[in-house]
Each structure stands twice: as structure tokens, then as C-alpha cells.
């Protein structure tokens, strides 16, 4: 019996289509594959950013795979051919590994890249990113921001920069159609007549950096002799009610009484008849049902009741 062998895939490569971190891994079938024409050959692909402890592993019948990477670091990948046991009348046969790497040749020293990059998706409507210039760069240094997400034909440059002392220090993005729940890729590169500037790459999902507007229309309602219901309305904008968590801060007679996190637009507070003043503020955040992370809104305007017996009426400012 001759031992069944299979070759590794040919021309395994990582292709950068210019999407700022979304890369294509592709390969050609191994030589002599038609010996196994009645058989579906599979490929086991492993890849990671250099420095990562764990490999991502994919088994596929295709000749390509796409995923996002951190272009601040290199990428390494390896692949081999798998012949399932059905093809070999026995155990699975694997080829040797084909390996490849990819990295962007860095220009400039790390200190020249932008510092303290911060992006916020205000009210799930307006994306704004800001940064500080690199350490020790001269005033002639200018930074440019490019972005891409699946759905765009190619990476786009910011068209509305925020400037300070003639330097770009931020970007106001245009309306970003169908851009949430997918990776959003940013590159900030730079130019200077004096020295090369290091590029920086960032990836996030927009729903995870939302900062909502604060809640509005805060009201009090006496429910019973010892309960007051605090109510408010969701902030204006595109975020549905089911996506909010709220944090309430309540002060009774200048003493913090309660801080609470709730999922609805109401909170019932136990009070005593002696309470002379009650104030509360609320802030909102996108919850775990709609995102993996988020930023608390600013606090709402304070709503207070003072000077009258809280038990006598509905309180509405």
C-alpha cells in the first residue's frame, strides 16, 4: 500500500485591499489535487496578530478568508490541506503547513504617531474623533484620518477636520450609513517636512462608543404615603427605549439618598413625611442588549421639589 499524501496549498498570501486592517487571506489548491476529485478537500487556516498568544482557527472549503487585523502589529498565518478520512479509507491526512506573514513597514519613530485618540458616536448619530499630536513633532506636522467599513467601496478621508494652531486634531464624520454592528477601521497618518510620521490604526464598532443625550422631562408622582415615583423620557434621537440603561442620583434634604441603575424610565422611591426637599438627576447609557460597551451621557438637568408637603400633589416642573 502506498501512503496517501497531499500537498500544501500554493501561493498562500495575505492581501491588503486598502481597507485599513480588513485583510484577505488567499491561496491556490495544492498540486495534484485531481487525484482526489471525488473528495471534498478542506483547508485548516490559523492566523493571528504577531504577539497574540492564541491563533484563530478556521476550517474551510474555500480558497480565501477575510478578517480584520491590527495593522499596528504584524500578522502571521499558516494553512494546510486536510483530506477527510472518507477520502483515504482511514484516518484524516494533513499536508505540511504553508506559512506567510504580512506587516506594514513602519515609518517614523513611535512617538510621532497621534496620542490619546478618542472617538465618540454622539447619540448614535454623529461620530467625532479627536487626538493629540505626537510627542516632539513640529508644527509643520499634519495628520490625516482615513476610515473604512464594510459597505464602502474604498477607504475615505475625513473632509471636516477639527483644527488647533493650523494642525488637524480631530475629525467630524459625515452621516455614516449602515455603519453599526460591524468593524469600523481608522488610520491616522501624518506628514512633515522634517521627519517621517508613524501611522496609527484603530478598530471599533460604533454601537460600542455611543454617548447618548441625557434623559428629559423629569417628573415626580406621589404613589402612596411613603412612595414617590420618579419618571423621565428617553432622549430625542434614533436610540430606541429598549437600548437604554439609566443611572439615577437622588438627594433628599441635601443628603445623597440613593444612587441606582435601572432599565426603565421610572424609579419608585421610599420616602418619609418629613422630607422637605427632593432632587434627582438621571443619565443614560446604551445597554448590553444593544452594545457591548458604551459611554454614560451627561447628567440631565436637576429636577427638584421643595417647600411643600410632597404628599399633597403630583410634582411636575
Amino acid at each position: 500500500d502506498t501512503e496517501i499524501k497531499v500537498n500544501p496549498p500554493q501561493d498562500f498570501e495575505i492581501v491588503d485591499p486598502g481597507y485599513l486592517g480588513y485583510l484577505y487571506l488567499q491561496w491556490q489548491p495544492p498540486l495534484s489535487l485531481d487525484h482526489f476529485k471525488e473528495c471534498t478537500v478542506e483547508y485548516e487556516l490559523k492566523y493571528r496578530n504577531i504577539g497574540s498568544e492564541t491563533w484563530k482557527t478556521i476550517i474551510t472549503k474555500n480558497l480565501h478568508y477575510k478578517d480584520g487585523f491590527d495593522l499596528n502589529k504584524g500578522i502571521e498565518a499558516k494553512i494546510h490541506t486536510l483530506l477527510p478520512w472518507q477520502c483515504t479509507n482511514g484516518s484524516e491526512v494533513q499536508s505540511s503547513w504553508a506559512e506567510t506573514t504580512y506587516w506594514i513597514s513602519p515609518q517614523g519613530i513611535p512617538e510621532t504617531k497621534v496620542q490619546d485618540m478618542d472617538c465618540v458616536y454622539y447619540n448614535w448619530q454623529y461620530l467625532l474623533c479627536s487626538w493629540k499630536p505626537g510627542i516632539g513633532v513640529l508644527l509643520d506636522t499634519n495628520y490625516n484620518l482615513f476610515y473604512w467599513y464594510e459597505g464602502l467601496d474604498h477607504a475615505l478621508q475625513c473632509v471636516d477636520y477639527i483644527k488647533a494652531d493650523g494642525q488637524n486634531i480631530g475629525c467630524r464624520f459625515p452621516y455614516l450609513e449602515a455603519s453599526d454592528y460591524k468593524d469600523f477601521y481608522i488610520c491616522v497618518n501624518g506628514s512633515s517636512e522634517n521627519k517621517p510620521i508613524r501611522s496609527s490604526y484603530f478598530t471599533f464598532q460604533l454601537q460600542n462608543i455611543v454617548k447618548p443625550l441625557p434623559p428629559v422631562y423629569l417628573t415626580f408622582t406621589r404613589e402612596s404615603s411613603c412612595e414617590i415615583k420618579l419618571k423621565w423620557s428617553i432622549p430625542l434621537g434614533p436610540i430606541p427605549a429598549r437600548c437604554f440603561d439609566y443611572e439615577i442620583e437622588i438627594r433628599e434634604d441635601d443628603t445623597t439618598l440613593v444612587t441606582a441603575t435601572v432599565e426603565n424610565e421610572t424609579y419608585t422611591l421610599k420616602t418619609t413625611n418629613e422630607t422637605r426637599q427632593l432632587c434627582f438627576v438621571v443619565r443614560s447609557k446604551v445597554n448590553i442588549y444593544c452594545s457591548d460597551d458604551g459611554i454614560w451621557s451627561e447628567w440631565s438637568d436637576k429636577q427638584c421639589w421643595e417647600g411643600e408637603d410632597l404628599s399633597k400633589k403630583t410634582l411636575l416642573r
Epitope: E13, I14, V15, Y24, Q26, L31, D34, T100
Partner: antibody
């Protein structure tokens, strides 16, 4: 349908350079390797260069290595071959061809005649 | 380099007859052989890959066989449009190499 349209004929002097192009359509260009093959007048076929789909791998025979450079622009689906230090024995019709998934050449361009003569 | 030796150089035949072209590799190329047809004044056209598999659109009168070092292209019934030069090519290893060609002519 798959089409490979090559640039026009070239007449150059020995020692000169020329760059051929091959515009592809009808398939996902970046997924396929591409080759150049030449045919001297009245002669057989001679493989000249191959490039992988993403451009990471290039292959040449010894006869042209260091003189010929195969490149591709996947954004415009165009294959190129830059030929330097041309000699009279480089006179040939140059064909671009798509490399199929088994490394054979399944589609061919119409050919570009390159004449090297003083 | 792997040398591909084709025979015969010229193949005179009559319409409707079967013909075969031989291609021998100087070393083992497994099944990694393709066959091409080049009609007068035209670009080559792919006929066969992996020694025995026809490309789509290629008439079934064309067939290929062989593995290792010996390969054959067979036309079961020659038609007038088959007048051409036929080339074999190995792609088992770089440099890719072609046979010298076999010219099919009608007597």
C-alpha cells in the same frame, strides 16, 4: 465572460525597455494568478513569468530573471510586464494568460508583438 | 528544468480518423500536465488540465491520459477545425515548461 485585452505592438531598440499591459474583465482578478508566455516567430511557447493573485509571489525562468518584472494592479484589474535590457532574441508575441486553480492557463489574451531591432 | 518532449513533430491525418500526440517529461510530474491548441494566427486555447480533465466547452472528442512521465492527447475523430499546433505543458514545478508542439495537418 472572461476577457484579457493586451496593449498594442511595440518596436524597440536593443538595450531599451518596454512595459506591456493586459486588462482583465469577467472574473475576480485578485483571486487568480496571472502569467506571461511568449512565442518567437515560428517557434513554440516559452513561459516568461507568473504572479500570484495578491502579488506576493512572482516566478521567472533564468532566461529573463533580473530583466523582466511582472506586476499587477488589482484595483484596475491590470497585469503588467516591464522588460528591460531587451535583446534581439526577446522578439516574440507575448501572451498574458490567467492561471486556473490548478496552475494551468485557462484563458489567454490576443497577444502583443514585441520587435527588438536596431 | 523539466524537459517536455513531444512527438510527432508533424501529424498528417485524414478527416474522421483518430490521432494521438505523445508528451514525455524528463522527470515525474504526477498529473500536473495541460494541453493547448493553437490554430493558425490565433492565441493558444486550453483543452485539458490535470492530464485528463477537459475544460468546459471543449468537445468530448478530445481526451487526455497519463501520469508520471508519459502523457497522451487523443482526438477520436479529427475535424477540419482541429488543424492546429498542440502543446503540452507541465506545471508540477517552476520553471513551467512546454513541449515543442505537434502540428496537425489534413492530408
Amino acid at each position: 465572460q472572461v476577457q484579457l485585452v493586451q496593449s498594442g505592438a511595440e518596436v524597440v531598440k536593443p538595450g531599451a525597455s518596454v512595459k506591456l499591459s493586459c486588462k482583465a474583465s469577467g472574473f475576480t482578478f485578485s483571486s487568480y494568478g496571472m502569467s506571461w508566455v511568449r512565442q518567437a516567430p515560428g517557434q513554440g511557447l516559452e513561459w516568461v513569468a507568473t504572479i500570484s493573485g495578491g502579488g506576493s509571489y512572482t516566478y521567472y525562468p533564468e532566461s529573463v530573471k533580473g530583466r523582466f518584472t511582472i506586476t499587477r494592479d488589482n484595483s484596475t484589474s491590470t497585469l503588467y510586464m516591464e522588460m528591460r535590457s531587451l535583446r534581439s532574441d526577446d522578439t516574440a508575441v507575448y501572451y498574458c494568460a490567467r492561471r486556473d486553480l490548478r496552475s494551468a492557463m485557462d484563458y489567454w489574451g490576443q497577444g502583443t508583438l514585441v520587435t527588438v531591432s536596431s | 528544468d523539466i524537459v517536455m518532449t513531444q512527438s510527432p513533430l508533424s501529424l498528417p491525418t485524414t478527416l474522421g480518423q483518430p490521432v494521438s500526440v505523445s508528451c514525455k517529461a524528463s522527470q515525474n510530474v504526477d498529473i500536473n500536465v495541460a494541453w493547448y491548441q493553437q490554430r493558425p494566427g490565433q492565441s493558444p486555447r486550453a483543452l485539458i488540465y490535470s492530464a485528463s480533465y477537459r475544460y468546459s466547452g471543449v468537445p468530448d472528442r478530445f481526451s487526455g491520459s497519463g501520469s508520471g512521465t508519459d502523457f497522451t492527447l487523443t482526438i477520436s475523430r479529427v475535424e477540419a477545425e482541429d488543424v492546429a499546433v498542440f502543446f503540452c505543458q507541465q506545471y508540477n514545478a517552476y520553471p513551467l515548461t512546454f513541449g515543442g508542439g505537434t502540428k496537425l495537418e489534413i492530408k
